[in-house]
């Protein structure tokens, strides 16, 4: 077993020790005090002075060094001889041991190097991992951006194609519009031609009407003459009858004729004791002319003369001025009593007007005017109303002040349009106003958003067409 060790003795000299079996060899290398003394002014690692040493000192120092060198050289030579003479075998072993030791040192150094290399490698791996992470993250971001860019590019492409489609569509529509314009021009031309033809036709009709009017005047004159003749004949007959009426039975029959009861309105009918609702014959004031009217003997004490009723759409209310003047329809159903009769009646005494309304949802409402009358035909049967009460709106749906009556052939409204033609039916149109109870009759589920229906604006608005309406009058003092 051999071992080689390097250490220091108690005074700090270097010593080399070789262990061989049970023998141990120690080599002490000589050192001079001058060399070792830290207090010596000549220590090699002392701070260099600014001023140079004295020459004699230098020479002395060199001499000392030379002698030490000489001693050392001699000592080394002796040692060398000793080793060569006495320790050739051990030398081999020592060399082997030295090689082993150096190998161990080398291995240790190698191990250290390996450890350091491993540490560096680990650090590098860490850095590499970080770089990889960063790279991966960047790659992902790049991928995302790439995808986003692709998506945007696709969207742009889609939009571009959409724009192209729209442009194509636009071009097509433009072409269509141009075609339509051409068609319209042609149509306008044909309409103009039709209009010219119609004007010619109207002119012809006007001349025919004028001729008919002339004939009517002639007929009226003839009629008047005939009426006069008839009147004269009646009087003659009456005189003759009076002269020859000698029997009591004849006298009694004439008396009965003179005492026949006539009713001016339904209030008169009610007062006479006839209190059942139904159709009664009424006589025009100051005249023998008669008309049939429906008397409502139940509502609010009875005695109401019905002047208008809508309930099922069975009667056409788009009528002429003359028809509205004399009346039309069936008094027990849908009808208009007649403007002339109502005008004459309401100018005799003060009347109230009650308008009863029903919607399609089963609701009922009414408007009551405490004073109502119509002007004569000379003033287009203008309506006059005062004192509104009731549940069908606090504002009158018949425009105030009252308007003239208009029909499809008599435009007396305040609109540049012709309300009666546009909204249908005869009414006291303003321009065109908030009501028209003589409008088109619309059935249920078709009765909304109708501008030409049966309208009472302040109860149901402008587009609601009512289910049923009744207009009735009664003397204010009933």
């Amino acid at each position: 077993y051999s071992n080689f060790r390097k250490s220091m003795d108690s005074v700090g000299r270097k010593q080399y020790q070789v262990q061989h079996g049970s023998c141990s060899y120690t080599f002490l290398l000589p050192e001079t005090d001058n060399c070792r003394s830290s207090s010596s002014p000549y220590v090699s690692n002392a701070v260099q002075r600014d001023a140079p040493l004295d020459y004699d000192d230098s020479v002395h120092r060199l001499q000392v060094l030379e002698s030490i060198m000489e001693n050392n050289t001699q000592w080394l030579m002796k040692l060398e001889n000793y080793i060569q003479d006495n320790m050739k075998k051990e030398m081999v072993e020592i060399q082997q041991n030295a090689v082993q030791n150096q190998t161990a040192v080398m291995i240790e150094i190698g191990t250290n190097l390996l450890n350091q290399t491993a540490e560096q490698t680990r650090k590098l791996t860490d850095v590499e991992a970080q770089v990889l992470n960063q790279t991966t993250r960047l790659e992902l971001q790049l991928l995302e951006h790439s995808l986003s860019t692709n998506k945007l590019e696709k969207q742009i492409l889609d939009q571009t194609s959409e724009i192209n489609k729209l442009q194509d569509k636009n071009s097509f529509l433009e072409k269509k519009v141009l075609d339509m314009e051409d068609k319209h021009i042609v149509q306008l031309q044909s309409i103009k031609e039709e209009k010219d033809q119609l004007q010619v036709l109207v002119s012809k009709q006007n001349s025919i009407i004028e001729e008919l009017e002339r004939q009517l005047v002639t007929a009226t004159v003839n009629n008047s003459a005939l009426q006069k003749q008839q009147h004269d004949l009646t009087e003659t007959v009456h005189s003759l009858l009076t002269m020859i009426a000698t029997s009591s039975s004849a006298k009694n029959s004439f008396a009965a004729k003179e005492e026949q009861i006539t009713f001016r309105d339904c209030a008169d009918v009610f007062r006479s004791g006839l209190t059942t609702s139904g159709i009664y014959t009424l006589t025009f004031p100051n005249s023998t002319e008669e008309t049939k009217a429906y008397c409502d003997m139940e509502t609010g004490g009875g005695g109401w003369t019905t002047i208008q009723r809508r309930e099922d759409g069975s009667v056409d209310f788009q009528r002429t001025w003359k028809e509205y003047k004399v009346g039309f329809g069936n008094p027990s159903g849908e009808h208009w009593l007649g403007n002339e009769f109502v005008s004459q009646l309401t100018n005799q005494q003060r009347y109230v007007l009650k308008i009863h309304l029903r919607d399609w949802e089963g609701n009922e409402a009414y408007s009551l005017y405490e004073h109502f009358y119509l002007s004569s035909e000379e003033f287009n049967y203008r309506i006059h109303l005062k004192g509104l009460t009731g549940t069908a709106g606090k504002i009158s749906s018949i425009s105030q002040p009252g308007n003239d009556f208009s029909t499809k052939d008599a435009d007396n409204d305040k609109c540049i349009c012709k309300c009666s033609q546009m909204l249908t039916g005869g009414w006291w149109f303003d321009a065109c106003g908030p009501s028209n109870l003589n409008g088109m009759y619309y059935p249920q589920r078709q009765n909304t958003n109708k501008f030409n229906g049966i309208k009472w604006y302040y109860w149901k608005g402008s587009g609601y067409s009512l289910k049923a309406t009744t207009m009735m009058i009664r003397p204010a003092d009933f």
Epitope: G433, T448, Y458, G461, G463
Partner: nanobody, 120 residues
């Protein structure tokens, strides 16, 4: 000339309240039925509510019934819409409109609208 000017719109949180006003001029306000109509972003016009001329009768769309209240002050020529318990779906431009006598239930004059945004 007839003019209708809405105001009172703005941003409000769900469950919040707003009161819209519509100032009318150029016509006899007390003689006309008035309506509120709204238009959600990208959608069509939807009727919201109406009030008759004297304020005695009102009507509402099912979607706002119980939450919105229409009213009017004829002395001030102003129409109102009180909106409570607002929802995100109430976000829209709100218009007031006049129902003409002969408009067949349609509107002959409109305001310029006021935007109501319901968002948290």
């Amino acid at each position: 000339q007839v003019q209708l000017v809405e105001s009172g719109g703005g941003l409000v949180q769900p469950g919040g309240s707003l009161r819209l006003s519509c100032a009318a001029s150029g016509f006899t306000f007390s003689s006309y039925w008035m309506h509120w109509v709204r238009q959600a972003p990208g959608k069509g016009l939807v009727w919201v509510s109406r009030i008759n001329s004297d304020g005695s009768s009102t009507s509402y769309a099912d979607s706002v019934k119980g939450r919105f209240t229409i009213s009017r002050d004829n002395a001030k020529n102003t129409l109102y819409l009180q909106m409570n318990s607002l929802r995100a779906e109430d976000t829209a431009v709100y218009y007031c409109a006049r129902e003409g006598y002969s408009s067949g239930g349609q509107f002959d004059y409109w305001g310029q609208g006021t935007l109501v945004t319901v968002s948290s």
